[in-house]
């Protein structure tokens, strides 16, 4: 029996490791799983968030894992994608669905960040120059849109590079080649990885790379 | 239809413990469904006291500590509450709910005195 | 526990009056918020659940809204029938909680 306190709880099942799998949720003291209609990745970011997970991957809309069983707790979830837990996005109400079956469970991938490598390039040192991030093993880009100091300021921490001095756009260092992983970030400065801040999903942009991001960090200015 | 039905002494001497059983029709208790007891006050006040769920699991409102166990006895398809050691404050309306996740289906309510 | 704040205790109306009623949450319990009518020598019976659903069969000149900590019950034109004390009531979390109630009366 238990007393009081949240009665909800939430992990990812049957995926490779704790960062990816089937949504369940626990309530009422019953595990049960998510319907994928609607499913979104302002919900994804909510669940890696939660999870300590903080980097949304993919957002599948079925489960990559096995159909999970018993009660279909949440349909239509709709999150903004700051909320703190997948229980503060709007849904259906608890049990509530629309005929939903286990085939629709959503299922989620997030990364711990072990995974994900940055560096800054053609600047000359390693704390100036175009933006690339090592993801799923490939080297690729930022784009330069709405790119700014806040960007710039979680890159130069993130690589114990210093304050950041300067951003640029424009392929300023050079074009890249490969994938572009992120177009319209939004950080507020203060993330521990550019990953973490709020983006619409990886390799997600209408860019190309003569739009490729680069940053001037204090610790490469003064080797510059 | 699921429906409730309250059944209990009336009356209780303070220091006494308490037993109310809710007799459910309609539906099998082990089926589905979390099964509660909320009590309401003189002047209205509601408390959820806690609930026993269809597999058997039960959580309790802290307020009600050691106070408070629920059972239920699957056989005759009722759940039951048991309050020790009560006192004049416990005198309430106690009703058996259940539902989901909501308090969707009610009982019509046991009035309970507690007196010497 | 989250304490639920209902507003007002009691409301003198006439009928065809528009009746609002607001419940205030302690803390955010996001939409998770249910509201009961209770009329005289009955037991509550459930209108609203998750802030604004209504539940079947129960009229849509009742309706509620609000998301965080604020939320309102509103009937649009009150009917004799009507005249009870409707409590909110939040689900998020253990314990379940109550609104103190709002009897509506007759002027």
């Known amino acids: 029996s238990s007393l009081g306190g949240t009665d909800k709880e939430l992990r990812l099942v049957d995926g490779e490791n704790k960062c990816s799998g089937r949504v369940e949720v626990k309530v009422q003291e019953e595990w049960g799983t998510v319907c994928n209609n609607g499913w979104s990745m302002e919900a994804v970011s909510v669940i890696c968030n939660q999870l300590g997970c903080p980097t949304a991957i993919k957002a599948p809309g079925w489960a990559n894992s096995s159909a999970g069983s018993g009660r279909i707790w949440m349909d239509h979830v709709s999150c903004r994608g700051n909320e703190s837990a997948l229980w503060d996005c709007k849904h259906d109400g608890w049990g509530k669905h629309s005929n939903c079956t286990h085939q629709q469970d959503a299922g989620v991938t997030c990364s711990d960040g072990s995974n994900l490598e940055m560096r800054l390039t053609r600047g000359g040192n390693m704390c100036s120059g175009r933006i690339e991030i090592k993801f799923q093993g490939r080297w690729g880009t930022v784009c330069d849109d709405n790119f700014n100091i806040d960007h710039a300021s979680v890159i130069c921490r993130q690589l114990e590079c210093g304050s950041a001095v300067s951003f640029s756009g424009s392929s300023n260092f050079g074009e890249g080649s490969g994938p572009i992983w992120f177009d319209d970030l939004i950080c507020n400065g203060n993330e521990s990885a550019l990953w973490n801040c709020k983006h619409q999903g990886w390799g997600k942009h209408n860019c190309d790379h003569a739009e490729d991001a680069g940053v001037i960090c204090s610790k490469g200015a003064d080797l510059s | 239809d699921v429906q409730l039905q309250e059944s209990g002494p009336g009356l209780v001497k303070p220091s006494q413990s308490l037993s109310l059983t809710c007799t459910v029709t309609?539906?099998?208790?082990?089926?589905?469904?979390?099964w509660n007891w909320i009590r309401q006050f003189p002047g209205n006040k509601l408390e959820w006291m806690g609930y026993?769920?269809?597999?058997?699991?039960?959580n309790y409102n802290p307020s009600l500590k050691s106070q408070i166990s629920i059972t239920r006895d699957t056989s005759k398809n009722q759940f039951f509450l048991q309050l020790n050691s009560v006192t004049t404050e416990d005198t309430a309306t106690y009703y058996c709910?259940?539902?989901?996740?909501?308090?969707?289906?009610w009982g019509q309510g046991t009035t309970l005195t507690v007196s010497s | 526990s989250v304490v639920m704040t209902q507003t007002p205790k009691s409301l003198l109306i006439s009928i065809g009056d528009r009746v609002t009623i607001t419940c205030k949450a302690s803390?955010?319990?996001?939409?998770?918020v249910a509201w009961f009518q209770q009329k005289p020598g009955q037991s509550p019976k459930p209108l609203i659940y998750?802030?604004?659903n209504r539940y079947t069969g129960v009229p849509d000149r009742f309706t509620g809204s609000g998301y965080g900590t604020d939320f309102t019950f509103t009937i649009s034109s009150v009917q004799a029938e009507d005249l009870a004390v409707y409590f909110c009531g939040q689900d998020y979390t253990s314990p379940r909680t109550f609104g103190g109630g709002t009897k509506l009366e007759i002027k």
């Open positions: 309609g539906y099998s208790i082990t089926s589905d469904y979390a």
């Open positions: 709910v259940s539902g989901t996740y909501y308090f969707d289906y």
């Open positions: 998750y802030a604004s």
């Open positions: 803390q955010s319990v996001s939409s998770d």
């Open positions: 026993i769920t269809y597999s058997g699991i039960t």
